[in-house]
């Protein structure tokens, strides 16, 4: 019989608003009061097993006690009504859970999208957390027809996909209702034609066709998405070279109406391009499609757009009446080769007479020439045709080169080695820059580059190493032959020397010592030696440092103490720091030469 509860709490399943007040009433049953000899005064209220202070109780009558909570801040409160029975034993009467939360906020920013081939999906912001189960329902209607409600799933409460087919060109009104145990609110209504919310499928079957007639164009063709039968489209076409990471875009005004092909112009010959395309409603109302799959195409070859860089070297050990000349040239970069270079054609004309032709697959040609003046020409050939000719005058043996560049400077900047000069007054056809690494261990093997006659500043185009000394030579080339070369040394990046100088004594006197050292080998300098510092000390004394100009190879220490052991070492400094050499010791004599004790 006592399995039946001794009483009950009202309300039974309360849902209350956070930070509000709440009152619960426990009503005891007569049979229970009789059995335990209790009344409402014996009621003890507990929350989550903690006793609530009596001040919060109100005895309503002999059977009922109430408890009031102010500013509820817990989301779940287990509230129990208990009675004190014989010998102060606590007996549970009834228990409830007080659930607290917030009413829903008005949903905001309602928007809809129709992905082609799918049904309309709308999404919204639901506002603050309610801590309660809150149902969101998307409502939609025509002026003449109500559509089935779309109930948002519990795991995606801020969006819903309708169950009916989208109808374009008929305005629809859409809104969201949010409801929980504490209230119901409605979003603002939005009214629109779904055709203005379309996200088309991307164009497909994108393909690229090149043109034999024009090496600067590629024609794109594609299949439009099915929605083309309903709306007019505009496009965004992007392209890049195969190895680039950034995309270029066709001007929007060129692709602003429905089409299924487009010719991209002003492309580089013999270059692989990657294309992609997306589309949207022509008037810009709606959403861009995703990008199509990418498609590649290669522009047709064009004749090389530039003559190769062209230079020569004369073997100094030439036989009587002849000299060995090595003609050399650079391969054209792809953007100038405009195709696969098949071969090079070299012609050599002795002054006003004999012509020799050579077809070469390499980038050099060694020829034996007389001591006369020659004119050499070079063209590069691909499938389409030949480049313009590079022309080089190889002067006669007795030619005296003059007119060098002036004010030659070289300096590192932005991880490149820059060279600049003042142009000679005479008309320069081109400049040849040669550079090599100076080393005590290996000969100076030169690389080279050509610059236009109008240039007076450039950077060396090669794989340059840090902390290596480069000897850079600039030769102006005139119509009648090369001018005088000018050279300069430079570093891409300096470092402290790898080794310090080894100091030794040249002569030691009673109060002075002449120190000497060798210049550091270029391989260990790692930069320009700006100065030396000599450090010397006695065993008991402080160290003294003396700065010495880098042009010196000896130095005299004066005011030394006689009959004393000195320790000396030397450091060499570049712009990036210094390095000490080994320590050396010497002892000053007790007496000067010829001095008697």
């Amino acid at each position: 019989e006592l399995l039946d509860p001794c009483g009950y709490i009202s309300p039974e399943s309360p849902v209350v608003q956070l930070h509000s007040n709440f009152t619960a009433v426990c009503v005891l049953k007569e049979k229970c009061m009789d059995y335990f000899h209790v009344n409402a005064n014996y009621i003890v209220w507990k929350t989550n097993h903690f006793t609530i202070p009596k001040e919060q109780y109100t005895i309503i009558n002999r059977t009922a006690s109430s408890v009031t909570f102010t500013d509820i801040s817990s989301l779940n409160i287990q509230l129990t009504c208990n009675i004190l029975t014989f010998g102060q034993l606590e007996q549970n009467v009834y228990g409830i859970t007080i659930i607290s939360g917030l009413p829903p906020e008005k949903p905001k920013n309602l928007s809809c999208i129709v992905n082609e081939g799918k049904k309309m999906r709308c999404e919204w912001n639901r506002g603050r957390e309610t801590h309660l189960e809150t149902n969101f329902t998307l409502k939609s209607e025509w002026a003449t027809h109500k559509f089935a409600d779309c109930k948002a799933k519990r795991d995606t409460p801020t969006s819903c996909t309708v169950d009916y087919s989208t109808v374009y060109f008929v305005n629809i009104e859409v809104w969201v209702e949010a409801e929980n145990a504490l209230g119901k609110v409605t979003s603002d209504h939005i009214n629109f034609d779904p055709v203005y919310k379309v996200k088309p499928n991307p164009p497909h079957n994108l393909s690229v066709i090149n043109s034999e007639e024009l090496s600067s164009i590629l024609k794109l063709t594609w299949t439009n998405p099915s929605i083309k039968s309903v709306i007019r489209l505009k496009y965004n076409i992007q392209y890049r070279t195969k190895d680039a990471s950034t995309w270029s875009q066709i001007p929007p005004e060129d692709t602003a109406s429905t089409r299924s092909s487009f010719t991209v112009q002003d492309l580089k010959p013999f270059t692989e391009y990657v294309f992609r395309i997306c589309c949207m409603k022509e008037d810009g109302k709606g959403y861009w499609s995703d990008w199509s799959e990418e498609a590649n195409g290669i522009t047709y070859e064009d004749r090389p757009s530039k003559a190769p860089s062209f230079w020569y070297k004369i073997d100094p050990s030439h036989a009587q009446g002849y000299r060995t000349v090595q003609l050399m040239w650079k391969t054209l970069p792809p953007f100038e080769a405009n195709g696969k270079i098949l071969d090079y054609e070299v012609t050599l004309t002795r002054w006003k007479s004999h012509l020799q032709n050579y077809t070469v697959n390499d980038t050099k040609l060694t020829v034996n020439l007389t001591n006369d003046r020659y004119v050499a020409t070079l063209t590069a050939r691909n499938l389409v045709g030949k480049s313009d000719a590079a022309v080089l005058t190889i002067p006669a043996c007795d030619f005296q080169a003059t007119h060098p560049v002036m004010d030659l400077k070289a300096f590192p900047k932005d991880n490149m080695l820059w060279v600049e000069w003042t142009t000679p007054r005479e008309s320069v056809k081109k400049y040849i820059l040669e550079w090599c690494v100076l080393s005590d261990k290996a000969p100076c093997i030169a690389d080279w580059q050509q610059e236009d006659g109008t240039v007076h500043r450039t950077h060396l185009r090669g794989n340059l190493a840090e902390s290596k000394c480069y000897l850079i030579t600039v030769t102006p080339v005139y119509a009648d032959g090369p001018g005088s070369p000018e050279s300069i040394k430079a570093y891409l990046k300096q470092a402290p020397p790898s080794k310090g100088p080894t100091v030794r004594t040249k002569k030691v006197g009673k109060n002075e010592a002449v120190l000497e050292w060798d210049q550091l080998p270029v391989d260990v300098q790692n930069g320009f030696i700006r100065n030396y510092t000599i450090f010397y000390r006695t065993i008991i004394g402080n160290e003294t440092a003396v700065n010495v100009d880098s042009s010196h190879t000896e130095y005299t220490l004066s005011s030394l103490t006689s009959d004393t052991l000195y320790m000396v070492r030397m450091a060499a400094y570049t712009d990036e720091g210094g390095k000490d050499g080994p320590e050396f010791t010497f002892t000053t004599p007790k007496f000067a030469q010829g001095e008697i004790e």
């Epitope: 087919s165 989208t166 109808v167 309903v230």
Partner: antibody
Framework: QVQLQESGPGLVKPSETLSLTCTVS????????WTWIRQPPGKGLEWIGH???????NYNPSLKSRVTISVDTSKNQFSLKLTSVTAADTAVYYC??????????????????????WGQGTTVTVSS | DIQMTQSPSSLSASVGDRVTITCRAS??????LNWYQQKPGKAPKLLIY???SLQSGVPSRFSGSGSGTDFTLTISSLQPEDFATYYC??????????FGQGTRLEIK
């Protein structure tokens, strides 16, 4: 109450051009497709084509090379031109209104509504 | 083109009868089929659109059903004014719109 009235010659010579006009009264020409349908004597209905108020046209592929439909919104009229007619073009020609509304089902598209207002029809005979 | 085939081509019935006309599409047209009624010497009149939606002003004894390829027009209790020819029409938006060949409903 919207009404449609076809007008044009009842007799056209073979190889000439058939021209008909449909006048819309009692309502706007906007927000609808305006359709031409024909019915040869004792036969079924054949859709010729239609035009929207913005001028977008759709034609029956079997007639496309010979048909032009145009609209004049200022006069609330739309017209049909059918070139190079033969005796097979003899029919009752109807104009009709099709409310805008295209339903999307996957990537297929359907006119949602039916042709809800029709003219009474005009008989055109092709004969020399 | 989508072909529409109506059956029967003609049928005889009496006032008060329940009559069913069927229409079959050569490929799926979802639920986008319309039914028209045409009386001799008159223009067709729209009865049902989108397979089952009753056009405004049309008596409720007319009803439509079906989807995909098979559709029916039902007249629940035939009235004297219902004797006419009935056409189905598919409304696929890519041309052409096509009609069935018609079903002639006569008084028995």
């Amino acid at each position: 109450q919207v009404q449609l009235q076809e007008s044009g010659p009842g007799l056209v010579k073979p190889s000439e051009t058939l021209s008909l006009t449909c006048t819309v009264s009692g309502g706007s020409i906007s927000n609808y497709y305006w359709t031409w349908i024909r019915q040869p004597p004792g036969k079924g209905l054949e859709w010729i084509g239609h035009i929207s108020n913005s001028g977008t046209t759709n034609y029956n592929p079997s007639l496309k090379s010979r048909v032009t439909i145009s609209v004049d919104t200022s006069k609330n009229q739309f017209s049909l031109k059918l070139t190079s007619v033969t005796a097979a073009d003899t029919a009752v020609y109807y104009c009709a209104r099709l409310p805008l509304g295209i339903a999307a089902v996957d990537t297929d598209y359907y006119y949602y509504f039916g042709m809800d207002v029709w003219g009474q029809g005009t008989t055109v005979t092709v004969s020399s | 083109d989508i072909q529409m085939t109506q059956s029967p081509s003609s049928l005889s019935a009496s006032v008060g009868d329940r009559v069913t006309i069927t229409c079959r599409a050569s490929q799926s047209i979802s639920s986008y089929l319309n039914w028209y009624q045409q009386k001799p010497g008159k223009a067709p009149k729209l009865l049902i659109y989108a397979a089952s939606s009753l056009q405004s002003g049309v008596p409720s004894r007319f009803s439509g059903s079906g989807s995909g390829t098979d559709f029916t027009l039902t007249i629940s209790s035939l009235q004297p004014e219902d004797f006419a020819t009935y056409y189905c029409q598919q409304s696929y938006s890519t041309p052409p719109i096509t009609f069935g060949q018609g079903t002639r409903l006569e008084i028995k």
